[in-house]
Interface confidence: low
């Protein structure tokens, strides 16, 4: 439970671009693996994941949220890194890729971190942002979804992510928690909410609400590790449960709704 | 300043069950892991168990595992340890300590199951 | 279970090191305390926290560092009323671990 950069090189999760160190080669994105079992499953999966520009290490199906029904929460860790950081650097891991919960029940965003030098009271940071679009509404319009890829490609950067790199002044943007050495503290806007920063950096929820759905960035800041990237992020997305969702994921079965 | 008293222990009988309580004051209390520690007559410290902030994350010790239930009240800023099946071996003086690398101890309260 | 010396001693003044190893990285990084116990049964007092950190009441004299897995203790200018045993404590992926205490002399 103690409190808990990225590799140069690589992508980072503020949407900065690449910074490469000389020393340090491009790093191969993860690639995708399907999961779903049927046409539209797989239909639903392609227009969500294609999105994710490789960062997903899993599929998943969506269904339009109703408002008043049962939810999911679909939770889709990305990795901003997947190299090892030069001397004297953070490297943060956000792993896990994909997490599947019920609303109102609790979720980790799992994050780690390495430092190359003595750990001297890094400061854990994890902040919210609010997608740059509408993922949800893109996943089922394919014509969008086709023309977004289409325009990545063109424009030679398959590892643009829509959904996450605009600039802060277009979006919410909140710091949920901090920890430095043994305290945690929560950002005035999660002021009674159970959540807490566990494990070296994980952030956890006791219970997830609609409003939780955006973008959160683990960022570990250090005096003494001042190279690389010290940032990875996490999708969280509440989305509606309705009878679609059993197609769309086939063998999910949703436990009982707790207030 | 920082105070952490424990409470409960005293004697106890092989396979009851004891409730120890530390009321914690000073400090922002649900911004901190708490933990547990013992140490027996004569031997040295060992962690019992430990809960986070906000108590959703526990853990315990391979010694007490299956047999402790850790809990905090934020609003009391109080934390509890429920031992069952008391053994032999669970004598000694019980510690709440406060942050995961430890950076506040109680004065601790004596356990003697006999 | 974490490995320090049994005892060490030193006259008033003098530079003291002891050394602690052992530990399991915990999610890629250590952490350790360190404990002082002036006598048995007696409330341990933390000298050093988060591998270096001194609580604000606890003299300049100590001072915490780490090596790898390696964590050191150092009290420099040591003095009479520092004999204790000290124990050193680490976080680990299954929990909290202790080592069995140093006897300090002086």
């Known amino acids: 439970m103690q409190q808990d950069g990225l590799g140069v090189g690589t992508r980072n999760g503020s949407g900065k671009g690449r910074s490469v160190h000389p020393s340090w080669p491009w790093c191969a994105p993860r690639p995708l693996r399907y999961f779903g079992r049927d046409a539209r499953a797989r239909r639903a999966q392609t227009a969500a994941m294609a999105l994710l520009a490789g960062g997903l290490s899993r599929g998943l199906g969506s269904h339009p949220a109703a408002a008043g029904r049962d939810a999911v929460v679909f939770v889709w860790l990305l990795l901003s890194t997947w190299c090892t950081a030069p001397a004297r650097a953070i490297q943060v891991t956000v792993s896990n890729p994909y997490h599947v919960v019920i609303l109102f029940q609790p979720v980790t965003l799992p994050c780690t971190y390495q430092m190359t030098s003595t750990p001297t009271q890094p400061i854990v940071i994890w902040k919210y942002k609010s997608f740059c679009r509408d993922r949800i509404a893109d996943a089922f319009s394919p014509a969008s979804v086709d023309n977004q890829l289409n325009a990545q490609l063109a424009a030679g950067n398959p590892g643009y992510n829509p959904y996450v790199e605009c600039q802060d002044s277009v979006r919410t943007v909140r710091v949920v928690a901090t920890k430095q050495g043994n305290a945690v503290t929560l950002g005035d806007y999660y002021q009674g909410r159970r959540i807490t920063i566990t494990g070296n950096a994980d952030l956890t929820f006791d219970q997830t609400a609609w409003g939780d759905s955006g973008v959160y960035y683990c960022s570990v800041v250090s005096a003494q590790d001042l190279q690389g990237n010290n940032e990875a992020y996490a999708e969280l997305i509440v989305l509606g449960r309705t009878s679609g969702v059993a197609e769309l994921l086939p063998g999910f079965q949703a436990g009982p709704i707790e207030d | 300043a920082v105070t952490l008293d424990e409470s409960g222990g005293g004697l106890q009988t092989p396979g009851g069950a004891l409730s120890l309580v530390c009321k914690a004051s000073?400090?922002?209390?649900?911004?901190?892991?708490m933990q547990w520690v013992r140490q027996a007559p004569g031997k040295g410290l060992e962690w019992v168990t430990g809960?986070?902030?906000?108590?959703?994350?526990?853990r315990y010790g391979s010694a007490v595992k299956g047999r402790a239930t850790i809990s905090r009240d934020n609003g009391q800023s109080t934390v509890r340890l429920q031992l069952n099946n008391l053994r032999a071996e669970d004598t000694g003086t019980y510690y709440c300590?406060?942050?995961?690398?430890?950076?506040?101890w109680g004065h601790g309260t004596e356990v003697t199951v006999s | 279970a974490l490995t320090q010396p049994a005892s060490v001693s030193a006259n008033p003044g003098e530079t003291v090191k002891i050394t602690c190893s052992g530990g399991?990285?915990?999610?890629?990084?250590?952490?350790y305390g360190w404990y002082q116990q002036k006598s048995p049964g007696s409330a341990p007092v933390t000298v050093i926290?988060?591998?270096?950190q001194r609580p604000s009441d606890i003299p300049s004299r100590f001072s915490g560092s780490t090596s790898g897995s390696t964590a050191t203790l150092t009290i420099t200018g040591v003095q009479v009323e520092d004999e204790a045993v000290y124990i050193c404590?680490?976080?680990?992926?299954?929990?909290?671990?202790f080592g069995a205490g140093t006897t300090l002399t002086v």
């Open positions: 404590g680490t976080y680990e992926d299954s929990g909290g671990v």
């Open positions: 399991s990285s915990y999610a890629g990084s250590y952490y």
């Open positions: 809960i986070s902030g906000s108590g959703s994350s526990t």
């Open positions: 000073g400090f922002d209390f649900s911004s901190y892991e």
């Open positions: 300590a406060r942050g995961s690398t430890i950076d506040a």
């Open positions: 926290y988060y591998n270096d």
